[in-house]
């Protein structure tokens, strides 16, 4: 029997496999910013370089007794989870430890920043293979810590951070809230969110995925041959850092965007009981548990997409929400969601050379979310076509008029605030293939892309009877790029993508008074990439 | 993920009457002061002064030195603990919170963040 956590994240076909870079040596280096560690432990000796970096605050309390094994406990365990010979995820990986947490597990933002700068300097002085930085720590939201993570990520370093153990929104903590880090929540052996005393794993839109983080067996600093179990989002992050190290060991040229997309795509889906999370966070929290993905050679040129939620706009009348993709990703569609249903739609606009997804609150609304669908589309050329709102009673049509461009998403934005005078926008798949159709007072935005072998089609599913949500999924081999809710209910909450599922949400009151003839339709745009084929629209 | 979280951002654009010094009075602070929303996690007295992205190496040092000089005129001792060159331009400083208004008016300053604790998870 192998430890449950390794069984969970490493599929059977990987168990005996040794991950090696093409030239035969594992050149990936993991930097661990944590407590001091016991480098002589049987799990990690010979694999760990204990750097001379030390930037920690004084321990609290006059009677604090600095006991080496206690000081090393957290870091040693994590080093073992990442690269331990017998209980580690990436057994061959070399690891560098930087001490930024004291014997009580406390550090400072400034100490962490100096540690990150130390890594950057090391990188400049002696460029090496791929670097993974593990940040098994969390503090309150810090603009500068997030900015430092962004700067380091842009140099090609992959940062993995603990979501935090506060049973709270991870966006309120750093570095968990930095978009450029891979943020990891913790699950237990039953794939359920980890409870830690009265608290537990953080959650929300800033979490990228979950990984084992309860009763994780790893190196104990008590003795050089001891093992112990520890729990927390640090352990979960260490698993993902190990997975990333293995991915990079096989394919050293994988970028952060590719790594994140592949982690998400190949994770175990829908096993977490979302009821553990606060109701307002359930839709924002990914239902994903990490597993080691196969190499790109085994999976071919699959179109990979992820959903990125914005922060909540807030309730003011003109409040907007903005969702952004990573620089390497293409924004293929933009939708919006509001719990009250009072929203004025969504659109894509360019800000500083990058296309962003925006959503607008409506008068009396409690606020909106913008929902971006961010995809990896090799050699893509994407553009937005928009048409201002038509006169009353007329439809607005937008299609992709450039040769070989296909429709990947539609957005609709209403000029009027009076929700009663407008009908919902529509997507027409049969009568007008590849068109976005908006009803009165709606500006329509079509996201059009050209990429080698990219083909797309619309898939719709409608429900006439009472239903809180309507869903439609893209079939195997196709990837969801766009998701919209079509006319039917007098009030829809909006639409969003969950993995390959398009979810259209309907307001409770709208359900009650709807006539049977008014179907609410979830419309998905499903695309696939077939590098040998020409870009096309599939009817 | 890119919006500021539960975070305290305080505008400390105080009137610029700094000992009647012309160069100081001319510069009105547009920089902001930020600190952790959780009071128990704050480390008052230690601040990360973050400069504009294009700030040159020499300018970072000059800004830190200028802050020390101006603080000294007011009878305060400032300790520059670290200068950041490689990830972002800025410096870490130990000083009285009384000097925040002064620091925010320095040229090149984008924002100042009070240091705070992070914890093993």
């Amino acid at each position: 029997s192998i430890p449950w956590n390794l069984e969970r994240i490493i599929p059977a076909w990987h168990q005996t496999e040794e991950d090696r870079s093409p030239d035969g040596s594992s050149q990936v280096e993991v930097y661990l910013l944590d407590t001091s560690i016991q480098g002589a432990h049987r799990e990690i000796e010979g694999r760990v370089t204990i750097t001379d970096f030390n930037s920690v605050p004084e321990e609290d309390g006059t009677r604090f007794h600095r006991q080496a094994s206690k000081c090393d406990s957290h870091g040693t365990h994590l080093a073992g989870v990442v690269s331990g010979r017998d209980a580690g995820v990436a057994k061959g990986t070399s690891l560098h430890s930087l001490r930024v947490l004291n014997c009580q597990g406390k550090g400072t933002v400034s100490g962490t920043l100096i540690g990150l700068e130390f890594i950057r300097k090391s990188q400049l002085i002696q460029p090496s293979g791929p670097l993974v930085v593990l940040l098994p720590l969390a503090g309150g939201y810090s603009r500068i810590l997030n900015a430092a993570c962004r700067h380091l990520a842009r140099t090609g370093v992959v940062l993995v951070a603990a979501a935090g153990n506060f049973r709270d929104d991870a966006c309120l903590y750093s570095p968990a809230s930095a978009p450029e880090v891979i943020t990891v929540g913790a699950t237990n052996a039953q794939d359920q969110p980890v409870t830690l005393g009265t608290l537990g794993t953080n959650f929300g839109r800033c979490v990228d995925l979950f990984a084992p983080g309860k009763d994780i067996i790893g190196a104990s600093s008590d003795c050089s041959t001891c093992f112990m179990s520890q729990s927390g989002t640090s352990q979960a992050a260490a698993h993902v850092a190990g997975i990333v190290a293995r991915m990079l060991s096989r394919e050293p040229t994988l970028t952060l965007a590719e790594l994140r997309q592949r982690l998400i795509h190949f994770s175990t889906k829908d096993v977490i009981n979302m009821a553990w999370f606060p109701e307002d966070q359930q839709v924002l929290t990914p239902n994903l548990v990490a597993t080691l993905p196969p190499s790109t050679h085994e999976t071919g040129g699959q179109l990979l997409c992820r959903t990125v939620w914005s922060a909540h706009s807030g309730p003011t009348r003109t409040a907007t929400a903005t969702a952004r993709c990573a620089p390497e990703e293409e924004l293929l569609s933009c939708s919006s969601f509001s719990r009250s249903g009072r929203r004025r739609g969504d659109w894509i606009e360019a800000i500083g050379g990058q296309q962003v997804c925006k959503a607008l609150n409506a008068f009396g609304g409690e606020g909106v979310y913008a929902v971006a669908r961010c995809c990896l589309v090799p050699r893509a050329n994407c553009s937005i076509h928009n048409t201002p709102a038509a006169r009353a009673g007329l439809e607005t049509h937008v299609h992709c008029h450039q040769k070989d461009h296909v429709l990947t998403g539609c957005s609709f934005h209403w000029e009027v605030e009076d929700l009663s005078v407008r009908r919902q926008p529509a997507l027409r798949s049969r009568r007008q293939p590849g068109q976005c159709v908006g009803h009165q007072a709606a500006s329509v935005y079509a996201s059009c892309c050209h990429a080698p072998g990219l083909e797309c089609k619309i898939k719709e599913h409608g429900i006439s009877g009472p239903s809180e949500q309507v869903t439609v999924a893209c079939e195997a081999g196709w990837t969801l790029t766009g998701c919209n809710v079509l006319p039917g209910a007098s009030l829809t909450l909006g639409a969003y993508s969950v993995d390959n599922l398009c979810v259209a949400r309907v307001h409770d009151t709208a359900r009650a008074d709807r006539t049977s003839g008014e179907a609410t339709v979830a419309a998905a745009i499903c695309c696939r990439s077939r590098p040998s084929a020409k870009a096309s629209w599939v009817q | 993920q890119d919006e500021d979280g539960d975070y305290e951002e305080l505008m400390l654009a105080l009137p610029s009457q700094e000992d009647g010094l012309a160069d100081e009075a001319a510069h009105v602070a547009t920089a902001t002061f930020r600190r952790c929303s959780k009071e128990a996690w704050r480390l008052p007295g230690t601040y990360i002064v973050v400069l504009m992205e294009e700030t040159q190496r020499l300018q970072i040092e000059q800004t830190a030195h200028r802050l020390q000089t101006r603080a000294a005129r007011r009878g305060y001792v400032i300790k520059v603990l670290h200068i950041f060159y490689d990830l972002f331009p800025g410096f870490l400083v130990k000083m009285s919170s009384d000097l925040l208004g002064l620091a925010l008016k320095l040229p090149h300053v984008e924002y100042i963040e009070e240091d705070s604790f992070v914890f093993a998870q």
Partner: antibody, heavy 126, light 106 residues
């Protein structure tokens, strides 16, 4: 119950390689709960740990012997082996194999040598 | 490496007497210390682990105590089969054994 049995030549020439095998019966060497170790005892002297191995093949050696020791495992035969190269008369000893508990699963537990094989005397002489 | 020093080298006692064996470590081994018994021509047998825990099947007359650097093995009333060599062993930093204490019949 679990039993361990050492086997191999009782006489080795100086500068050659000493080779011993330990056969485990009454239990599986593939258990993730244990490591498997070699310990030696020169005549009339104390005990010295040589090294240990995990079923996965991970090896751990006494730093003073590291350059000369190789321990390997054959899970199909439920055996693990010791090779000690460039032997001298100082390597003359009774060589014991033993189970070192506990390994990775469970994480906590007695991490000691128990049980032991009955030992085999290896004499290094020309 | 951690050096374990056992004393006395030889202890001459009669059956029924109390035996007290000492083991001192060159640095702290916490409670990661074991005691083994070895009879002539036999392999060592685990008596005590983690300083004070009796191994399976070991009679109650054997007890261990101590932590850090000083440890004691006590045999409350010597039986004839208890006359043997006793070794201490640490696992704080890999594995090292003490030089042994021979308990012989007086």
């Amino acid at each position: 119950q679990l039993q361990l049995q050492e086997s191999g030549p009782g006489l080795v020439k100086p500068s050659e390689t000493l080779s011993l095998t330990c056969t485990v019966s009454g239990g599986s060497i593939s258990s993730s709960s244990y490591y498997w170790g070699w310990i030696r005892q020169p005549p009339g002297k104390g005990l010295e740990w040589i090294g240990s191995i995990y079923y996965s093949g991970s090896t751990y050696y006494n730093p003073s012997l590291k350059s000369r020791v190789t321990i390997s495992v054959d899970t199909s035969k439920n055996q693990f082996s010791l090779k000690l190269s460039s032997v001298t008369a100082a390597d003359t000893a009774v060589y014991y194999c033993a189970r070192e508990g506990s390994g990775v699963v469970p994480a906590a537990g007695p991490n000691w040598f128990d049980p032991w094989g009955q030992g085999t005397l290896v004499t290094v002489s020309s | 490496e951690i050096v374990l020093t056992q004393s006395p080298a030889t202890l001459s006692l009669s059956p029924g007497e109390r035996a007290t064996l000492s083991c001192r470590a060159s640095q702290s081994v916490s409670s990661y210390l074991a005691w083994y018994q070895q009879k002539p021509g036999q392999a060592p047998r685990l008596l005590i682990y983690d300083a004070s825990n009796r191994a399976t099947g070991i009679p109650a007359r054997f007890s261990g105590s101590g932590s850090g650097t000083d440890f004691t093995l006590t045999i409350s009333s010597l039986e004839p089969e208890d006359f043997a060599v006793y070794y201490c062993q640490q696992r704080r930093n890999w594995f090292t054994f003490g030089g042994g204490t021979k308990v012989e019949i007086k």
